[in-house]
Interface confidence: medium
Amino acid sequence: SNQPPGGGGGSGGDCPGGKGKSINCSELNVRESDVRVCDESSCKYGGVCKEDGDGLKCACQFQCHTNYIPVCGSNGDTYQNECFLRRAACKHQKEITVIARGPCYSDNGSGSGEGEEEGSGAEVHRKHSKCGPCKYKAECDEDAENVGCVCNIDCSGYSFNPVCASDGSSYNNPCFVREASCIKQEQIDIRHLGHCTDTDDTSLLGKKDDGLQYRPDVKDASDQREDVYIGNHMPCPENLNGYCIHGKCEFIYSTQKASCRCESGYTGQHCEKTDFSILYVVPSRQKLTHV
């Protein structure tokens, strides 16, 4: 992994996690009833919910080949291949979509080899006696007069590679999105490469991440394609890369809408849900952990 100094791994999981393989996350998907049910909400993004002694574990059993076919994730990280990206999404239980084929940016030292091995972008530094929790790669400066979370992300050496972020702003490089996320202490994701244009759906861009992903006005987006398709189905525009998590994106010409043809074992509008058929019953007050 070749993360830049202080350069953060982008927005990660919803819970603090170290660099190890499991994330202990007590507040995640805990049900108050005596019956613990493994369903699509308790273990997402391709994870398999398993009984493990006293509790449940969300196993991310991805056997990823090591071929370098880089993809750029919506969290600003470059992954070795799409499998590693999916594994990271599973591991952090956080939606990460492919926004572009190839690395997010190609300067030396400006991408992360595997992304998730650097720790979640939402990693909370527990040293927060004065600051409160510092997230998104911020660190607590207890010696400062105005005590607070300090961001040491340095984007000064980064090249021009504009991106459109979930806050509706266009940034000069994915690094600046991570910097803004750190400074504002709020989650800001990359929606797509290239600056935000007038065809972007501002109702989605202007919100903090609420599980929705960037979906532009597809009709306008399709108008910019050079190819003309006579049939009813055509490939989705480039700016919908990653619209379908585990499936193929198709643009239905007659309705001017994008839809997903899901891979086997996945459902949902974006093929983001695993089709669970096994229920696990475990004692109450047990914690669900993710591995």
């Epitope: 190839g102 940016y105 190609s106 300067d107 984007c155 050496g157 980064y158 090249s159 021009f160 590679n161 504009p162 702003s169 266009s170 940034y171 000069n172 600046f176 910097e179 803004a180 290239g194 600056h195 935000c196 244009t197 007038d198 910019q224």
Partner: antibody
Framework: QVLLVESGGGVVQPGRSLRLSCAAS????????MHWVRQAPGRGLEWVAV????????HYADSVKGRFTISRDNSKNTLYLQMNSLRAEDTAVYYC?????????????????WGQGTTVTVSS | DIQMTQSPSTLSASVGDRVTITCRAS??????LAWYQQKPGKAPKLLIY???SLESGVPSRFSGSGSGTEFTLTISSLQPDDFATYYC?????????FGQGTKLEIK
């Protein structure tokens, strides 16, 4: 001093090729997107092509697509425009220009530094 | 491609005048518009980017406004050095396009 200097222009016959160069100095060339813009005699400005800083992403005007190729050598701080199958209507002053990267986090756009231009005349 | 239409094509004015040049886009381009000044035999010079942001070193008498499809460049008090041709340019889509230009000449 930030400087862009074009070269390689001249008189060429229709159907022939020409390669323009743009030497950059005074700034970190590899960090910037770069454009070629042309201006026919007595006419307005016409955008020709752009190349992103890493050289991977390129876009062309419809009028030159398939005939012109934009490229760059970051180690030499040089931008290129390979022009094939030249036509009379390609006669113009060709400028290279730098994408307005700005000093902050946010995307600005526009072209903030221009060369002095090099003249290409396509004539039989 | 997005078409950019400038008006007027030619504008006659005197030193001290307030002048306005209009640029209209064939479809909405948000605020992704730049204005340039060009003098004969010289390269263009960036004046305004992102519709209303003044480029560093450009006199404050130049200002830009508008969003969507209608944009204006205003020179609050014309100076002798301002007589030139002005171009608008959109960069909403990855096919940058310029307006046809407005020649500002001495009345």
């Amino acid at each position: 001093q930030v400087l862009l200097v074009e070269s390689g222009g001249g008189v060429v016959q229709p159907g022939r090729s020409l390669r323009l160069s743009c030497a950059a100095s005074g700034f970190t060339f590899k960090r910037y997107g770069m454009h070629w813009v042309r201006q026919a005699p007595g006419r307005g400005l016409e955008w020709v092509a752009v190349i992103w800083s890493d050289g991977n992403k390129k876009h062309y005007a419809d009028s030159v697509k398939g005939r012109f190729t934009i490229s760059r050598d970051n180690s030499k701080n040089t931008l290129y425009l390979q022009m094939n199958s030249l036509r009379a209507e390609d006669t113009a002053v060709y400028y290279c220009a730098r994408e307005n990267y700005g000093s902050g986090s946010y995307y600005n756009g526009g072209m903030d530094v221009w060369g002095q231009g090099t003249t290409v005349t396509v004539s039989s | 491609d997005i078409q950019m239409t400038q008006s007027p094509s030619t504008l006659s004015a005197s030193v001290g005048d307030r002048v306005t040049i209009t640029c209209r886009a064939s479809q909405s381009i948000s605020s992704w518009l730049a204005w340039y000044q060009q003098k004969p035999g010289k390269a263009p010079k960036l004046l305004i980017y992102k519709a209303s942001s003044l480029e560093s070193g450009v006199p404050s008498r130049f200002s830009g406004s508008g969003s969507g499809t209608e944009f204006t460049l205003t020179i609050s008090s014309l100076q002798p050095d301002d007589f030139a041709t002005y171009y608008c340019q959109q960069y909403n889509s990855y096919s940058w396009t310029f307006g046809q230009g407005t020649k500002l000449e001495i009345k």
